[in-house]
């Protein structure tokens, strides 16, 4: 009998040590005024009723889509941040209610549990070699420019860490939910030829170049492997209806109308009980009916209510990957580092990223033992 019990708390943007300590309506306390809070509730109601799981995930996984939505909705920064937290929770809730997502969650989890140990080992090796690369450069000349090598090798590594991490990044062809930059592979190949420095003797330059080349080629092989798995299993499931641009702008306009209507209602005495009606909302995929999710409420989820009995850990993997991708942005920036010291820092951040993925792996593994 396994000696451990696994529990996946539903994360909220601001996890609380004591989820029961605040009144229900106070989930955004400290950051928003009551009017904004009511608007967020209205917006969540709209998303629950009118937007499909796929489209919501698109919004949350595609940075451009999210920015387009925020711009179209004319949301101030604080409201956009709060809405994002609430939508993260809504997406989790929608996934929990959807049988297809349940099955896929299991499939992704099984794949991840099977593949992660090997991938982890290879990524550890990559991190070690990046450190060795930094040391090699440092020994030749402390200020040597290695930006090209780094941008080539690390952008792919961080991409793999975030993609491979949970074994289920939404990665499809045809422009759907691609989380890695288009043309990145070409950029990496080009980067391999980019190491030039008068301070490096030919032998050292060749060594560094060979190391970087080997590292990148191996990483690309892994990306290809992950891509193939994801391509087979996710492309149909996360295929998007219509044009992404139109979709996100359309939702954004609806939310803007909702926000304005709410603002107008706030100025009328006793009007807050009535909810503004949004005309011609962006519907879920053609003909698809999104199940209305009633219990537990988004507000409860935002306060950290645990749904252990309802939801296996695997349900939330897709969004955890999304978060890791968002949190990797500075790694991509760090990939432009020019000195060995900076490269070591980026390698350390990659190591921390791998640690986070490993933490998730251990929890999933323990869950499977039960």
């Amino acid at each position: 009998e396994a000696g451990a019990r696994v529990q996946q708390n539903v994360p909220s943007g601001t996890d609380t040590g004591d989820p029961q300590s605040k009144p229900l309506g106070d989930w955004a306390a400290g950051t928003m005024d009551p009017e904004s809070s009511i608007f967020i509730e209205d917006a969540i109601k709209y998303f629950k009723e009118k937007v499909s799981t796929q489209n919501l995930l698109l919004l949350l996984t595609d940075n451009e889509a999210w920015n387009g939505f925020v711009a179209a909705a004319e949301l101030p920064r604080n409201e956009a941040d709060e809405l994002r937290k609430a939508l993260d929770n809504l997406a989790r809730q929608m996934i929990m209610k959807d049988k297809n997502w349940h099955d896929k969650g299991q499939q992704y989890r099984n794949w991840f549990l099977k593949e992660f140990p090997r991938l982890k080992s290879e990524l550890e090796d990559n991190i070690r070699r990046l450190r060795a690369l930094a040391d090699g450069v440092q020994k030749v000349h402390k200020g040597t420019t290695i930006a090209n090598v780094v941008s080539g090798s690390l952008s792919i590594s961080s991409g793999i860490l975030t993609l491979v991490g949970m074994g289920l990044a939404p990665f499809t062809e045809g422009g759907s939910l691609v989380l890695l930059e288009p043309g990145m592979e070409l950029g990496i190949t080009a980067a391999l030829t980019g190491i030039t420095s008068s301070t490096m003797d030919y032998g050292k330059k060749w060594w560094t170049q060979a190391q970087a080349h080997d590292l990148v080629i191996k990483s690309l092989d892994k990306l290809k492997e992950v891509r193939e798995f994801l391509g087979e299993n996710i492309s149909n499931f996360l295929s998007l209806a219509g044009n992404t641009y139109q979709l996100t702008r359309g939702i954004g306009k609806d939310i803007r109308a909702l926000r304005r209507a709410r603002a107008n209602l706030q100025s009328v005495p006793h009007a807050s009980a009535s909810r503004p009606r949004v005309t011609e909302p962006i519907s879920a995929e053609s003909g698809e009916q999104v199940e209305r999710v009633n219990e537990p409420s988004i507000l409860e989820m935002s306060r950290g209510v645990k749904l252990t009995d309802v939801a296996p850990v695997g349900f939330f993997l897709v969004l955890d990957v999304v978060y890791l991708v968002y949190e990797s942005k500075h790694l991509h920036e760090g990939a432009k580092s020019e000195t060995a010291e900076e490269l070591k820092k980026v390698a350390q951040e990659l190591e921390e990223k791998l640690n986070m993925l490993n933490n998730n792996y251990k929890i999933l593994q323990a869950d499977q033992e039960l």
Partner: antibody, heavy 121, light 106 residues
Framework: EVQVQQSGPELVKPGASMKISCKAS????????MNWVKQSHGKNLEWIGL????????IYNRKFKGKATLTVDKSSSTAYLELLSLTSEDSAVYYC??????????????WGQGTSVIVSS | QIVLSQFPAILSASPGEKVTMTCRAS?????VHWYQQKPGSSPKPWIY???NLASGVPARFSGSGSGTSHSLTISRLEAEDTATYYC?????????FGAGTKLEIK
Amino acid sequence: EVQVQQSGPELVKPGASMKISCKASGYSFIVYTMNWVKQSHGKNLEWIGLINPYNGGTIYNRKFKGKATLTVDKSSSTAYLELLSLTSEDSAVYYCARGALYRYEGAMDYWGQGTSVIVSS
Amino acid sequence: QIVLSQFPAILSASPGEKVTMTCRASSSVIYVHWYQQKPGSSPKPWIYATSNLASGVPARFSGSGSGTSHSLTISRLEAEDTATYYCQQWSSNPLTFGAGTKLEIK
């Protein structure tokens, strides 16, 4: 400098519940798991469980199922251990300890100073 | 669950002596970690993954072992080594500790 600071000693009545806090500083809180360990009579160490601050995922030692609840507050980099329905058997020193990097899986590299809990009427 | 048994429970030796303490697992483990604890203090990581000394640990300490048998050795005992040493595993859930070996200086 990595530091793990726990809340002070507690004297609680049987049947009550209580919560111990563990504030982390000097590192990125979401990157490392936080473990909780019970030490009774200054001797045996028992692992209660761990929490992944990144997403709230937890693993519990079955022995502590229904007795302990682990939570985190990312905004304040604080982990919490809540002990329920306390009895004299729960009198002990409770430690929080950061999980080490993956290469030393299962190890705990930074420990809090411990919180002494005495259950007595 | 995997039970870790530590031998001896109490180890008494003179300064300068070589001492070895053992940690036996009820099932094979990938590696063990060792901690040192002095009275009134928290445990400190001492040896990671069977044989890697934690930061600041004197080189007179070493760790070895595999499978079900692991050991911690001090090549030349010093007074400051007086403490209780615990082994720990996480090859399977739950994570478990040994009952400790109390090292005393004669």
